[in-house]
């Protein structure tokens, strides 16, 4: 049976959950070291195609899985990315402060791909201003 | 037709354990995060506990931390709450709820419920 | 931990507009959705992420975000509207609701 709801990720839930993982942490994942990628090349399917090898690790399960609906349904973010730097590994919470640094900035600079992210940027500014995290 | 059907419910003496079942039928079980949510007598609408498609994360609310348990067998499309040392204040309906995202956000379906008494 | 909070209740006329106020520190940075819950039954989602209506629900029922408040509304509220409302937002890896409002249609 079919949800009468078709939810899918929206840019604030990405970036709060990208904040709530990396605040005050210094290491992600046991410090797992993953290919370093090019975001401007697509940022869903390209940080998912490295994250997706991470396993064992339910700090960073949310976050795959909205990559996941992300890049599966934006196709014109790119596909998953040919142009990986193979060569070179960083720590998966220097990938993910990466992608969070990225997708503000896109956002920032007015690089939009539609209202929709037009009235997500509006709200990720708000965020990025006013932004109170709580903790347990 | 989505359908949770809850069981399990009972009165209990505190300190006392239960076992909720969550039966789910019209639709892939094995597919949903599921979680539940408890409503006590006269009260608001409060979450208790999460778990993804496949078992492998779960969270719960610190109210309950370390005192209950969330379990799913997909095989038998059936979702779990092992509630132990229970406390009077535990007392509500608890409700099995299905979400339909794949990252955990909200919940689309609700079953009845089913009453848990905690009661000396 | 996040905390939503609601007015305990609302009273609107017979086919007038009832507003529903859900407030929460930086509730727009959030998705917000919406639940509708009648004496003895189970919770219905009325809105979904902050203003999406799912199937089967009339179109006088809306939401928005702004600021530090979402808010539900009701343009022309029925009796058959008369029930709690709960605002939910998702905040600490778990699901957050709202207190909750009871919404009286008067006539």
């Known amino acids: 049976s079919p949800s009468p709801v078709t939810p899918s990720p929206t840019l604030k839930e990405l970036i709060e959950e990208l904040v709530n993982i990396t605040q005050n942490q210094a290491s992600l994942c046991n410090g797992s070291m993953v290919w370093s990628v090019n975001l401007t090349a697509g940022m869903y399917c390209a940080a998912l195609e490295s994250l997706i090898n991470v396993s064992d690790c339910s700090a960073i399960q949310r976050t795959q899985r909205m990559l996941k609906a992300l890049c599966s349904q934006k196709p014109a973010a790119g596909q998953i990315s040919s142009e990986r730097s193979r060569d070179t590994k960083i720590e998966v919470i220097q990938l993910v402060k990466n992608l969070l640094t990225y997708v503000r900035g896109v956002y920032r600079h007015g690089n939009f791909r539609g209202l929709n992210d037009i009235f997500e940027a509006q709200k990720i500014e708000w965020h990025e201003h006013h932004h109170h995290h709580h903790h347990h | 037709e989505v359908q949770l059907v809850e069981s399990g419910g009972d009165s209990v003496r505190p300190g006392g354990s239960l076992r909720l079942s969550c039966v789910a039928s019209g639709f892939t079980f094995s597919r949903y995060n599921m979680g539940w949510v408890r409503q006590a007598p006269g009260k608001g609408l409060q979450w208790v506990a999460w778990?993804?498609?496949?078992?492998?994360?779960?969270s719960y609310a610190d109210a309950v931390k370390g005192r209950f348990t969330i379990s799913r067998d997909n095989a038998k499309d059936t979702l779990y709450l092992q509630m132990d040392d229970l406390r009077v204040d535990d007392t509500a309906v608890y409700y099995c709820?299905?979400?339909?995202?794949?990252?955990?956000?909200?919940?689309?379906?609700w079953g009845q419920g089913t009453l848990v008494t905690v009661s000396s | 931990s996040y905390v939503l909070t609601q007015p305990p209740s609302v009273t609107v006329p017979l086919r007038q507009t009832a507003r529903i106020s859900c407030g929460g520190d930086?509730?727009?940075?959030?998705?917000v959705h919406w639940y509708q819950q009648k004496p003895g039954q189970a919770p219905v989602l009325i809105i979904y992420n902050d203003s999406n209506r799912p199937t089967g629900i009339p179109e006088r029922f809306s939401g928005s975000n702004s600021g530090n408040m979402a808010t539900l509304t009701i343009r022309g509220a029925l009796a058959e509207d008369e029930a709690d409302y709960y605002c939910?937002?998702?905040?600490?890896?778990?699901?957050?609701f709202g207190s909750g409002t009871q919404l009286t249609v008067l006539g």
């Open positions: 709820a299905r979400d339909p995202s794949s990252w955990g956000s909200l919940f689309d379906y």
């Open positions: 939910q937002v998702w905040a600490n890896d778990g699901y957050v």
């Open positions: 930086n509730i727009r940075s959030k998705n």
């Open positions: 778990i993804y498609d496949g078992g492998s994360r779960t």
